[in-house]
């Protein structure tokens, strides 16, 4: 703490503020009749240097002048930028025990003259906003530096405002708090910034601008859209703008989109017609404004207007497929399936589907509406039937899609050849085929149909299908394809009134099955053994089973077992073997094989044939 200088004074030459690299002389003088005793020679003046309240140096050795007992002058050099405190103390040399007494102190500030401010830029937000200018102050001066912003305009008027920088605050922006009005649109303004501190002053170059250069319009507000006659594709966007705006930029996009549609509108006066909107789509709209066609700045984008366009009647055609099952000699069950329209085709919320089944010759018609994407009816097996389905929303219905009901696998000559199914990756399968060899009518399209080979899948799950043009011989199926599951894949070739199909099994990824089949019975018939089993549970198959293997060996034998490999058929659950010796006890077991390998063995059964073996 500095005393209130009762004992003496401290002065600095040339000044308490000096440029970096300069030296200063600090003089400490005692007031008359102040000191240690009546012997002035016992008065010793010392100078202490403090930085950030920490004593860093005793300048005893820096004395350049000493008027014994009354005053001392010290030279200080190499002062760092910022403020340094010097405290003069009186040390009474005849009394070693008493600490030095503070006399007085002084702060010396070391800094630099300000550089000319640069890169001045001014802006006024909105026609009624205020002018604010910012600049680059240059190097830190380490001194209190005053900045004056001066704006000269028409009619020989100049306005100015000041701020300062020091070690607590920085001044590189000033809001003049006054507004340039549109009646000055053509006027030129000159702005300059002057910086002054104890070591010098400097001025920026003058920066010239016009009202239009610096005024950034406020973003448009109160945005709304009016759909003409409740149209889903045409709407009038409306908004409020500042009076001087001559140019607008509109941007709009569906909410899930990543790219904007951009439109420039001149003299729109807060109104613009949009004609290319997608019905029943959530859109985001934003608008920006400019006061001048060529110069000036765009406003910020307005707040978003988010709204959904109205519905329009569905377009496009439904993708229909069907299954036929004979119930008895004169009735069949027809199950129709169709895929939902995509949003750009549905153009609204689909409320229901109109389904029609019609017998072509007798003109029998069955009609119904359903909210589901499937419909099942029992109809006579006789006659030629056709089905049609259309989708309806609040504005109307799509054109009906027709399909002829034919016997899908009834014509062998239409069966595609060399059907193969290859695993492409974890979630798709590549199906390829060759066209029917001797089709007596042209193939109009192929349908690739697939469903998981799991119990009840025909009744529980609708099929998945792809329509393929007649000149394509492959399809990559991915919808609902999961790894380690075997799918039955059918390729249908359809002509106008007939169908032929070929079937194959396939999987997208496989592992060896978890377990082998369970042998349930071994029976002897006509000198042959029949092995019966239950199939491996569906989750344990882990892909398409290619073969079953039946192993056997004599009980207690260490020889390699014999085996019989059976092509996998889902419908088969028993197989004969005929190479076992009578009255020898055998151990039998089974395994299953996928493309990835063989399962562990299933249960073991012992059996001793009785009859005469071949």
């Amino acid at each position: 703490n500095i005393d209130v200088c009762k004992l003496g004074t401290v002065t600095v030459q040339p000044a308490p503020v000096i440029p970096l690299g300069s030296a200063a002389n600090i003089s400490c003088s005692l007031n008359p009749k102040q000191g240690c005793s009546h012997y002035p020679s016992s008065n010793e003046l010392i100078l202490l240097k403090f930085v950030n309240d920490v004593l860093v140096e005793n300048l005893h050795g820096k004395k350049v002048h000493d008027h014994t007992g009354h005053s001392s002058t010290f030279q200080v050099t190499n002062l760092s930028l910022g403020m340094t405190l010097f405290v003069c103390k009186l040390n009474c040399s005849n009394s070693q025990k008493k600490p030095p007494v503070p006399v007085c102190g002084v702060e010396i500030s070391v800094g630099v003259a300000p550089e000319p401010p640069q890169n001045i830029s001014c802006v006024q937000e909105g026609e009624n906003g205020t002018v604010a200018c910012s600049w680059n102050s240059g190097k830190v001066t380490y001194l209190k530096t005053n900045y004056t912003l001066q704006l000269s305009g028409p009619n020989n008027l100049t306005c100015q405002k000041q701020c300062f920088s020091d070690n607590r605050q920085n001044c590189n922006r000033l809001d003049l708090g006054i507004n340039l009005s549109p009646d000055l649109a053509e006027s030129r303004f000159i702005v300059r910034v002057t910086a002054i501190n104890d070591l010098g002053n400097s001025s920026s170059l003058p920066h010239t601008f016009t009202f239009l250069d610096i005024v950034i319009p406020l973003p448009p507000w109160d945005i709304r859209i009016n759909f003409l006659n409740a149209s889903g594709s045409r709407g009038t966007l409306q908004w409020e703008d500042e009076g001087q705006v001559v140019l607008n930029q509109l941007r709009y996009q569906p909410l899930n989109s990543t790219s904007w549609n951009m439109v420039n509108a001149t003299n729109a006066k807060g109104k613009y017609d949009l004609r290319d909107l997608r019905p029943f789509t959530e859109y985001e709209f934003q608008i920006s404004s400019k006061l001048h066609l060529s110069g000036g700045s765009w406003s910020n984008w307005s707040e978003s207007l988010r709204t959904r366009t109205p519905e329009e009647e569905p377009v496009g055609i439904l993708d229909i497929w069907y299954m036929k099952q004979d119930i008895d000699y004169d009735r069949q069950q027809i199950s129709l399936f169709w895929k939902s329209l995509n949003p750009s085709e549905a153009r609204g919320k689909i409320l229901h589907y109109q389904v029609t089944l019609q017998e072509v010759t007798k003109k029998t018609t069955l009609q119904n509406t359903t909210r589901h994407t499937s419909w099942t009816r029992v109809i006579p097996r006789t006659g030629a039937w056709t089905a049609s389905v259309s989708a309806a929303n609040s504005k109307g219905a799509s054109a009906p899609t027709h399909i002829n009901i034919v016997d899908l696998c009834g014509t062998g000559l239409l069966a595609p050849h060399q059907v193969s199914a290859k695993s492409e990756n974890m979630d798709n399968i590549l199906v390829t085929w060759q066209p029917p060899k001797k089709a007596d009518s042209a193939v109009r399209e192929y349908i690739v149909e697939w469903r998981a080979l799991q119990p009840g899948s025909i009744t529980k799950f609708p099929p998945h299908w792809l329509r393929i043009p007649p000149d394509n011989m492959s399809a990559l199926i991915s919808e609902n394809i999961k790894p380690y599951i075997c799918y039955e894949i059918r390729v249908h070739a359809l002509s106008e009134s007939q169908g032929g199909c070929s079937s194959i099994r396939g999987d997208s990824k496989h592992k060896a099955p978890v377990s082998g089949p369970h042998i349930t019975a071994i029976t002897e018939k006509k000198e042959r053994l029949f092995i019966s089993w239950t199939h491996i549970p569906f989750p344990e198959q882990r892909g398409c089973i290619l073969h079953y293997r039946i192993y056997w060996k004599e009980r207690d034998s260490t020889a390699q077992p014999e085996l019989c490999e059976i092509q996998y058929r889902r419908s088969q659950n028993s197989h004969p073997i005929s190479s076992l010796q009578p009255r020898v006890t055998y151990v039998l077991w089974m395994t299953a094989v996928t493309a990835a390998g063989e399962s562990p063995q299933g249960n073991e059964r012992e059996f001793c044939p009785q009859g005469k073996a071949n």
């Epitope: 205020t130 028409p154 008027l157």
Partner: nanobody
Framework: QVQLQESGGGSVQAGGSLRLSCAVS????????MGWFRQAPGKEREFVAA???????VYPNSVKGRITISRDNAKNAVDLQMNALKPEDTAVYYC???????????????????WGQGTQVTVSS
């Protein structure tokens, strides 16, 4: 009601200084733009200086550097310091007050709502 009262006018030799003051009652000076105008005999009233509510000063180039306007919120007054006076500065000086926010408006008489009675300044050579 709002009242403005100028003081500090008088006679002075060319090159001398005067400090005019305008005391305001009824409204805080910190909330308004304050201006000084003058009218010489036989001439129109002209703008001398203004101080916006945001403390921005405005001067015509003809007086810039010789005249300083400042606000004293504690006294609810605005002062006009005039240095290096010239005979052509002789006029009646009026203080004015108004809710003005535009650059040009600060120099326009018709933008100010409240006016003082004026104080005479005479500069002799």
């Amino acid at each position: 009601q709002v009242q403005l009262q100028e003081s500090g006018g008088g006679s002075v030799q060319a090159g001398g200084s005067l400090r005019l003051s305008c005391a305001v009652s009824g409204r805080p000076v910190s909330d308004y733009a304050m201006g000084w105008f003058r009218q010489a005999p036989g001439k129109e009233r002209e703008f001398v200086a203004a101080l916006s509510a945001s403390d921005t000063t405005v001067y015509p180039n003809s007086v810039k550097g010789r005249i300083t306007i400042s606000r004293d919120n504690a006294k609810n007054a605005v002062d006009l310091q005039m240095n290096a006076l010239k005979p052509e500065d002789t006029a009646v000086y009026y203080c004015a007050m108004g809710p003005i926010g535009t650059f040009q408006g600060l120099a326009r008489q018709n933008e100010y709502h409240y006016w003082g009675q004026g104080t005479q300044v005479t500069v002799s050579s």
